[in-house]
């Protein structure tokens, strides 16, 4: 796993100190992957909690930085970064020692093989005349008398170490602060030197430049600044990561940086640097991480502290020990990737004297099968053999080898082949939003097979349709909008994922049924009138500029700003142009608007109307009765309401033709002492409905409704006529 934890040891001010964890994994940050975790690991080295919480800053999904240290003691201890997904989830540890500690490690990280002897050495930084206690993972391990220091150093020898011996070791003066301890990390590989795998029966590839063979998968964990399956290639100065893809920050390059990599490597300075704070350049003749490697260049080669021997023309090899007359395989990718089932062409180029020819170049697969080249291109400075590989299976993953053999000698170059399985969605795409003519879809789905996802193909077509699928290629990280669809229609939508390279297209995933919305109701109504029919009743009328093409009804919204309450009245009849709103709060100021709706979609709102409902009024007038006087007149009589809430200002009479569909009409009786009225101007032989209510501050309740018919033409009523002067006016239309 390409995971690096960097600590900048040049920064001694805790408030400026930071740790950065970088993942260079292909497809790192897929939404299905857990994020990088960077935290202080207090399980073994427990210090006081920091004065303020540490905070993480993320740079995309592949980098995370921990800052916010307030005092030097916040830095002491173990920090961990966790990255990768599933079986590749990996933890990288960094152990920070206080520069002002009593004891300081000569070397913090020790990687040893099973059965080896490990020697942990702490030199005295500030002497105390007390015993030194050694601990392993926080538990007591050993004590040394203070006089046992040898040349100012306390040493702990661990013989025949086994993997359980791995962990954090510390050396502390008795009765001294744990912050003054020397902290070490011991990594014990699960196998003896040069071996890996279950039973430790497999040979390591021979990691170069200080790379460490992983005891589980046999891969070389390369020091910072080196790459290749055997760490055979040096990166350019200032670069690190499995493919040299990362760059040390700032102008000082990798100076002052500690690099921690996945076990069993541990931590070291970058290539070309050494010392407890990685600030010292390598001495002449030394190179690599911690300057642990010696150049020993031959044949006029010069030593570069970052990359080792730089050979003069005519020589090559780690020590410039190989003459160019020996056949040499020229630059070749150290790791290649193909998709399962493909038949790739692999090229291998070689130079030498005598010149390599067709039969002299072979390709060896991991199972030992030898492939002969199918084509050879001869150029003045090289011969390139092309090998046609049969259909790849997962079993072809592993180390392949190109071999060249001439009378001048032989050379071989190993490279790693990764056979990948194209991704197949396990789930259907997800609907995020819908409208009448578009669907917004998340194409990101969980999948089987290998990433990274290079393209996502979305297929869609109407449900139950036999027409060809419409296809659209989309960015895997962005939601996609399917446009120009039909309203209120179901669509089957499915995803095909691809990974890079030939044959990277996976199969179709399951399809989801997504339905477009109704068309939007595009008309805006206008409020035409609003009448208060009582303290808690409001009649509202509205108009539309034309007949709606689409609409299920109207939504009337009443907003009571004083109470912060909204009431919504659904008129589920698109032909409606009036509504009676009841159960409102008397004495309330309402803001009212109306919208057309269709399915769940709202059209634009009318301009709002501001309506003030009067306070609740008096009880209903009593004992209303009516008597026809002529073919056009009816007399109404009633009694005052019981216990009105104040002096009655007027009565209101409502007249409506019985069984008619027209709106009612109203008359005001402005003299409250009058309790009768003659209603004139009525139609002959017509039945009418009457009711009456009083008004004090607000309108009161309606009385009982009475029914009476006007007389036929020419007939006069025999009864007495009592006429109210208030009734002289006609009807209030």
């Amino acid at each position: 796993v390409d995971l690096t934890l960097l600590a900048n040891l040049r920064i001694t001010d805790p408030q400026r100190f930071f740790l950065t964890c970088v993942s260079g994994e292909a497809g790192a940050g897929r939404s299905s992957d857990p994020p990088l975790l960077l935290e202080k690991d207090d399980r073994i080295v427990r210090t006081f909690p920091p004065g303020q919480p540490l905070y993480l800053a993320r740079n995309g999904s592949h980098q995370v930085t921990l800052r916010g240290f307030s005092k030097p003691s916040d830095l002491v201890g173990v920090f961990s970064c966790v990255g990768g997904a599933g079986a590749r989830r990996t933890r990288v540890l960094y152990v920070h020692n206080s520069p002002g500690a009593h004891l300081f490690p000569d070397k913090v990280t020790h990687t040893v093989n099973k059965g080896d002897t490990a020697v942990l050495s702490a030199h005295v930084h500030k002497e105390k005349q007390t015993d030194v206690i050694w601990k392993n993972n926080g538990s007591y391990f050993n004590t040394l008398d203070w006089q046992e220091a040898d040349d100012g150093r306390f040493q702990l020898q661990l013989q025949n170490v086994q993997p359980p011996s791995s962990g954090i070791y510390s050396a502390t003066y008795l009765e001294a602060s744990p912050l003054g301890s020397a902290f070490f990390r011991l990594i014990v590989r699960g196998c003896g030197a040069g071996r890996w795998g279950p039973g430790c029966v497999k040979d390591c590839p021979g990691c170069l430049h200080g790379g460490v063979c992983h005891d589980h998968d046999g891969e070389c964990v390369c020091p910072p600044g080196f790459t290749g399956t055997r760490c055979e290639q040096a990166c350019r100065e200032g670069r690190f990561g499995q493919s040299c893809q990362e760059q040390c920050p700032g102008t000082a390059g990798c100076r002052g940086l500690t690099f921690c990599l996945p076990d069993p490597y541990g931590c070291s300075c970058g290539s070309g640097w050494r010392g407890s704070q990685c600030q010292e350049a390598c001495a002449p003749g030394h190179f690599g991480a911690d300057c642990r490697l010696q150049c020993q260049c031959q044949n006029g080669g010069t030593c570069d502290r970052f990359s080792g021997c730089v050979c003069p023309s005519g020589w090559h090899g780690v020590h410039c020990e190989k003459s160019d007359r020996i056949p040499q395989i020229l630059s070749m990718a150290t790791e290649v990737e193909f998709n399962i089932g493909t038949m790739p062409r692999i090229n291998c180029a070689a130079a030498g004297n005598p010149f390599p020819v067709r039969g002299s170049m072979k390709l060896r697969k991991p199972d030992g099968t030898m492939l002969l080249s199918t084509k050879v291109i001869v150029e003045p400075d090289r011969t390139t053999a092309e090998f046609e590989v049969p259909s790849l299976t997962l079993g072809d993953s592993g180390f392949w080898e190109c071999r060249v053999s001439t009378s001048g000698g032989q050379d071989s170059r190993r490279f790693k082949v990764n056979v990948k399985v194209p991704p197949v969605p396990l789930t259907a795409p997800r609907l995020l939003a819908k409208q009448s003519r578009q669907l917004v879809v998340s194409p990101l789905v969980s999948f089987s097979g290998d990433g990274p996802i290079s393209s996502v193909r979305l297929h869609y077509r109407p449900q139950d349709s036999t027409i060809a699928w419409s296809a659209i290629v989309v960015d895997p990280s962005e939601n996609v909008t399917l446009m120009n669809l039909k309203p209120k229609t179901g669509y089957n939508v499915r995803v095909q994922l691809s990974r890079p390279g030939e044959g990277g297209e996976g199969g179709w995933g399951p399809s989801a049924l997504m339905t477009t919305d109704c068309p939007e109701p595009l008309l805006q109504p206008w409020l035409e009138s609003w009448h208060v029919e009582g303290p808690d009743r409001l009649r509202v009328s509205w108009s539309l500029p034309s007949v709606p093409l689409s609409g299920d009804g109207f939504l009337l919204r009443l907003w009571d700003g004083a109470r912060g309450q909204e009431r919504r009245e659904n008129i589920s009849f698109p032909q409606a142009r009036t509504a009676l709103l009841t159960g409102l709060t008397p004495g309330t100021h309402y803001q009212l608007d109306v919208r057309l709706y269709h399915c769940t979609l709202l059209g634009p709102a009318s301009p709002p109307a501001h309506v003030h409902l009067p306070p609740s009024g008096p009880p209903a007038p009593r004992h209303l009765h009516a008597q026809a006087l002529s073919d056009s007149e009816i007399q109404l009589m009633w009694q005052h309401p019981e216990a009105p809430s104040g002096p009655i200002s007027k009565y209101i009479v409502e007249i409506q033709v019985a069984g008619g569909s027209g709106d009612p009409q109203w008359m005001d009786v402005d003299r409250p002492e009058e309790t009768s009225i003659i209603v004139r101007g009525l139609n002959a032989s017509t039945r009418y409905l009457f009711r009456v209510r009083a008004s004090v501050q607000g309108l009161g309740d309606w009385s009982n409704t009475v029914e009476e018919a006007t007389l036929g033409n020419g007939l006069q009523s025999e009864g007495p006529v009592r006429e109210s002067r208030a009734a002289e006016e006609g009807l209030d239309q």
């Epitope: 409208q435 939007e520 595009l522 008309l523 805006q524 206008w526 409020l527 035409e528 009138s529 108009s543 539309l544 500029p545 034309s546 608007d593 979609l601 709202l602 634009p604 709102a605 009318s606 301009p607 709002p608 109307a609």
Partner: antibody, heavy 120, light 107 residues
């Protein structure tokens, strides 16, 4: 051809009043809502007020509520804006525009504008 | 009230460039949005109505998209005559607020 012609602008002191008019022609005035939009010198557009085709339904921006009154006379094909209690920040070109009847939400027809300057 | 926020407030581009102006509503407004162009001393001109419909007579290099809260006006190939200030306006609920405008000039 649809035409909208504003008038009634001018120089007025803070606290003063004006009545802006917008004469409409070339369409059935009583079928359309009408709006006022203003633009202070060097600034953006600000929606001011709306009135329904019948005149029964009106709406205002918060900044003018209680000071401005929109009205219309369908028999004269004229839209009005009564502006009272004027402030310096009311200085602007006032445009009248025809509101959409539905479906096409946007103001296609605009008048040329009338300038109101509030200054002491 | 619904707030309309345009970005950028001004931009400079070369003739032939693809130019994008965005408008964001403080709450969902469906498709009820218009775009206008206003040249100095002139009356605003309607370019796009109901979010994406091109007004008759407007060049096809202008297009509108979006719904809900995020809207975009795109000029596919900028011409010298496109120098102007552009405004968006919502029609979902009153008051029918405008964006603050985007001033477009040629480099």
């Amino acid at each position: 051809e649809v035409q909208l012609l504003e008038s009634g602008g001018g120089l007025v002191q803070p606290g003063g009043s004006l009545r802006l008019s917008c004469a409409a022609s070339g369409f059935t005035f009583s079928m359309y809502g009408m709006v006022w939009v203003r633009q202070a010198p060097g600034k953006g557009l600000e929606w001011v007020s709306v009135i329904s085709p019948s005149g029964g339904n009106t709406g205002y921006a918060d900044s003018v509520k209680g000071r401005f009154t929109i009205s219309r006379d369908n028999s004269k094909n004229t839209l009005y804006l009564q502006v009272n209690s004027l402030r310096a920040e009311d200085t602007a070109v006032y445009y009248c525009a025809r509101a959409p009847r539905g479906y096409s939400y946007g103001y296609y027809y605009w008048g040329q504008g009338t300038l109101v300057t509030v200054s002491s | 009230d619904i707030q309309m926020t345009q970005s950028p407030s001004s931009l400079s581009a070369s003739v032939g460039d693809r130019v994008t102006i965005t408008c964001r509503a403080s709450q969902g407004i469906g498709h009820y949005l218009a775009w206008y162009q206003q040249k100095p001393g002139k009356v605003p001109k309607l370019l796009i109505y109901t979010a994406s419909t091109l007004q008759s007579g407007v060049p096809s290099r202008f297009s509108g998209s979006g719904s809900g809260t995020d809207f975009t006006l795109t000029i596919s190939s900028l011409q010298p005559e496109d120098v102007a200030t552009y405004y968006c306006q919502q029609f979902n609920s009153y008051p029918h607020t405008f964006g603050q405008g985007t001033r477009l000039e040629i480099k």
